[in-house]
């Protein structure tokens, strides 16, 4: 699931990891675009073991997942701009 929130007023990630996580262990991905008090894009990954990690947006593997989710979302009807949720 991919979620994009436009409501955060500060950065949430203190530390970012680029270490690969297989998609089957990912429960949810949240993207916070830069702005609203945070100068950088943040990607937060909820894992199936209930732990949460901030992922470096430049990591190749997360970019591959994002691209796949973008392709998937292009074939689904749009939802309100403040939050996009893609199964």
């Amino acid at each position: 699931v991919l979620e994009v929130y436009y409501t955060h007023l500060r950065c949430r990630c203190v530390q970012e990891s680029s270490v690969f996580i297989p998609r089957r262990f990912i429960d949810r991905i949240q993207i916070s675009p830069r702005g609203n008090g945070c100068p950088r894009k943040e990607i937060i990954v909820w894992k199936k073991n209930k732990s949460v990690v901030c992922v470096d947006p430049q990591a190749e593997w997360i970019q591959r997942i994002m691209e796949m989710l973008r392709k998937k979302s292009s074939s689904t009807p749009p939802v309100p701009v403040f939050k996009r949720k893609i199964p």
């Epitope: 297989p22 998609r23 089957r24 593997w61």
Partner: antibody, heavy 121, light 106 residues
Framework: EVQLVESGGGLVQPGGSLKLSCVVS????????MAWVRQTPTKGLEWVAS????????YYRDSVKGRFTVSRNNAKSSLFLQMDSLRSEDTATYYC??????????????WGQGASVIVSS | DIQMTQSPSFLSASVGDRVTISCKAS??????LTWYQQKLGKAPKRLIY???ILQTGIPSRFSGSGSNTDYTLTISSLQPEDFATYFC????????FGAGTKLELK
Amino acid sequence: EVQLVESGGGLVQPGGSLKLSCVVSGFTFSDYYMAWVRQTPTKGLEWVASINYDGGDTYYRDSVKGRFTVSRNNAKSSLFLQMDSLRSEDTATYYCKTEEDYDGSYVMDAWGQGASVIVSS
Amino acid sequence: DIQMTQSPSFLSASVGDRVTISCKASQNINKELTWYQQKLGKAPKRLIYNTNILQTGIPSRFSGSGSNTDYTLTISSLQPEDFATYFCLQQSSLYTFGAGTKLELK
């Protein structure tokens, strides 16, 4: 040559404990996620647990959560499965296997020969 | 949890036959499907991963196809060494194996 060798299987009473080990050679162990998979004639193949490169991230099937613990020792190229509060339904052949490497590549898929675990009184 | 329904459970065929084995997922698994062959007393051996990528060293008579929820393993011309049990595995969300297809000599 890639090799995964399991040990530690055996007969144990319900409620008892057992620790399986898997020693690997022929590849850089710390580069790979690893998993335990079990097999029975009735239930077939079942994923049991997975662990990431440094052991900091672990995942379990629901039926073993809180009873089984997967761990690894990268210095000794070894994978472990500590099994506590064993039940008769845990009786199976347990295999260790490789998963993705650090880059997400899934080119290698190596399995051990299996360790037999029998839970019976 | 994703369920995998594999069919048939048993399949009788002759050397030279073309055979297909199917796996149906309970939801879209985005082509994250693997096929294994297992012989008695041995560990499973991967044949195909990501739906259609042939594992190095596996003969080209094995092929995989499918998308969304429906996947197929095809053996174009059965050889004597192909009589074994075949399993599918979804890796889209955790892991689920199919129940297996036992391929027997007719």
